[in-house]
Interface confidence: medium
């Protein structure tokens, strides 16, 4: 079996002269009973390895890639090229000879013919022979289309991927990056929201000692039981749990850029996996920006529990303080209505003091009359021995502006014949 | 996207001639060799005929002086006309890019029935 | 005429498993050898051409291998996808040859 090389790109063409069959036949004509024709192995498609690694270096293995890729088109353009030609001459030679044929067997049998037989043989013979060599390359030159097509195919899926996963990246560092400032952006928001708390907790503070100096002024113990929110340490405690997600998660997808880098880097020169490793690391990419959508979507849940969480904390702090405001308003107005009250007793007890001056200047008259006419008269005069004097004083315990405590005693005294008969004394203890 | 699309089946008595097409489309037609293939009711599969992108036919013994493969490629179709037809020619034919080599690219087939 | 043997008509899978499909050529067809899917009611697929090169947007499961006779071609990771006749086919030499097909069908 003859075996003959064609070409450098290590694909083998097989071709047995017995195989073929030694017969006339030109393009267009069947192979003739008995033909076995050997094919030639076509090359298959060169892989290439397109390496995605950092910009600089995909960019010089790309360049290199595509060169090499441009070269092996050129050379499979060019034996394409030649096969045609090979075709082409081959045919017109056919012609040239069959016509030559042609007009030979037109041409009178002379005695020359006998000469010109054995060369008539050897061009019959060297006919079949091109023309079983032009069937064979234009086999050849059609299996050599048919790889051609799948390396272009093949290139531009190649190059397809390529695009995709440097679009997959360059999403991914953006989203790293959007992360990155979104992480940054809720920590200010954070020490913004943290120094307001801070601010209202003071403010908060602040007004509480002046109500409680406010009460402690009046002396009415008003004990409100509210526990104060410790904003900071729950602020804190969320702020560390955010910061340690987003942390790990910037690790992560550091650790993972650092490793899917090396990993393709590495992979450049591996031509003939190009095709499964780019759609496995296309898949990978995906479910790696689903992984980090997820990661985002659960940072943007955690901002907004945040967020909610903290507006909830200053919803409950403002109706903290407006539940003390209230309570305030409320001890000013029953401050306000005791002090009123305060007002009515006092006039009430001086308008009672005032009766009882008038009494006892009323008693001391009556006394004076008494005695003067007991010296006067040596007979007692039993006029006055029914009468019954109720003598009523009140004693205030000094009655200070500043103080809402008041101790009344009313004191009875019952005298008969200028005799005490009945003391009685009430006290009115009065807490307003 | 590559398309081929064979059409012209049917029923023929023993004896008789078909002929079935192959038209194309997603590719420059005239640049590859093409084939038709068939597969027996039992599944096997059989080569039957090949055209080379100049014109040269390729057939095995069995159909050989009996089918004739061709093409337009003008019109981007292929052809095979069937004569003498037998019963052991009942299959699903299915035109395919690719002459003396791998087929890329088959169509859904066309199917042939000779019975009498 | 080559003839291209897959010793067996059928052969049984699970999802998820790793399945071979041999293919014997009765005289050294060198590496021109492909291998086709065909599933039911439909046409055929090229997967493997050149006994170990995936065609153009075949998955990576499919993997095609051997030279001269002995021809294997494997599904690393089977899929419900897959289950389907495939044929191993010489194109060494005229006429062109194929195998009776074998049938991969789940457990």
């Known amino acids: 079996m003859e075996r003959r090389r064609i070409t450098s790109a290590a694909r083998r063409s097989y071709v047995s002269s017995g195989e073929m069959m030694v017969g006339g036949l030109a393009p267009g004509r069947r192979l003739g009973p008995g033909t076995r024709l050997s094919l030639a192995r076509m090359p298959p498609p060169l892989p290439t390895r397109v390496d995605f690694s950092l910009a600089g270096a995909l960019n010089a293995g790309f360049k290199e890639t595509r060169a090499s890729e441009r070269a092996e088109m050129m050379e499979l353009n060019d034996r394409f090229a030649s096969y045609i030609e090979k075709v082409r001459f081959l045919e017109q030679q056919n012609k040239a000879l069959a016509a030559e044929l042609n007009q030979l067997r037109a041409k009178e049998p002379t005695k020359l013919a006998d000469v010109y037989q054995a060369e008539l043989r050897e061009l019959r013979l060297r006919l079949d022979q091109l023309t079983a060599n032009s069937a064979r390359l234009e086999v050849e030159r059609d299996n050599l289309a048919q790889d051609l097509a799948t390396v272009r195919q093949k290139l531009q899926d190649e190059t397809n991927l390529r695009l995709e996963a440097e679009n997959n990246l360059a999403a991914y560092r953006q989203e790293a990056d959007e992360a990155t400032l979104a992480r940054l952006d809720l920590e200010r928001k954070i020490e913004s929201l943290e120094e307001e708390i801070r601010f209202l907790r003071k403010i908060h503070e602040e007004e509480v000692r002046e109500l409680q100096e406010q009460l402690a002024r009046q002396q009415v113990h008003v004990e409100l039981d509210v526990a104060k929110p410790d904003l900071t340490a729950a602020l804190k405690e969320i702020r560390t749990q955010y910061e340690a997600m987003a942390s790990s998660n910037m690790h992560e997808a550091e650790e993972w850029y650092r490793s899917k880098f090396a990993d393709l880097t590495d992979a450049a020169a591996r031509n003939a996996e190009l095709l499964r490793q780019a759609k496995h690391e296309a898949n990978d990419y995906r479910r790696q920006l689903q992984s980090l959508t997820c990661d985002l979507e659960s940072l943007r849940g955690t901002n907004e529990s945040l967020e909610r969480q903290m507006r909830e904390q200053e919803e409950r702090h403002v109706r903290e303080a407006a539940s003390y405001q209230e309570a305030l308003a409320r001890l000013e107005e029953e401050g306000q209505s005791l002090k009123d009250e305060m007002a009515r007793h006092l006039q009430e007890y001086q308008d009672l003091l005032n009766v009882k001056l008038a009494l006892d200047i009323e008693i001391a008259t009556y006394r004076k009359l008494l005695e003067g006419e007991e010296n006067r008269i040596t007979i007692p005069v039993q006029t006055f021995s029914n009468l019954q004097i109720r003598e009523t004083s009140l004693d205030t315990k000094s009655v200070s502006e500043g103080h809402l405590k008041r101790n009344i005693v009313v004191k009875t005294v019952e005298m008969r014949d200028g005799e005490v008969i009945k003391e009685s004394k009430q006290e009115h203890k009065d807490v307003m | 996207e590559v398309i081929l699309v064979e059409s012209g089946g049917g029923l023929v008595k023993p004896g008789g001639s078909l002929k079935v097409s192959c038209a194309v489309s997603g590719f420059t037609f005239s640049n590859f060799a093409m084939s038709w293939v068939r597969q027996t009711p039992e599944k096997r599969l059989e080569w039957v005929a090949s055209i080379s992108s100049g014109g040269t036919t390729y057939y095995p013994d069995n159909v050989k002086g009996r089918f004739t493969i061709s093409r337009d490629n003008a019109r981007n179709i292929m052809y095979l006309q069937m004569s003498s037809l037998r019963s052991e020619d009942t299959a699903m034919y299915f035109c395919a890019r690719g002459g003396l080599h791998y087929f890329g690219y088959w169509g859904q087939g066309t199917t042939l029935t000779v019975s009498s | 005429d080559i003839v291209m043997t897959q010793s067996h008509k059928f052969m049984s899978t699970s999802v998820g498993d790793r399945v071979s499909i041999t293919c014997k050529a009765s005289q050294d067809v060198n590496t021109a050898v492909a291998w086709y899917q065909q599933k039911p009611g439909q046409s055929l697929k090229l997967l493997i051409y050149s006994a170990s090169y995936r065609y153009i947007g075949v998955p990576d499961r499919f993997t095609g291998s051997g030279s001269g006779t002995d021809f294997t071609f494997t599904i690393n990771s089977v899929q419900a996808e897959d289950l389907a006749v495939y044929y191993c086919?010489?194109?060494?030499?005229?006429?062109?040859?194929f195998g009776t097909g074998t049938k991969l069908e789940l457990k």
């Open positions: 086919h010489q194109y060494y030499s005229t006429p062109l040859t």
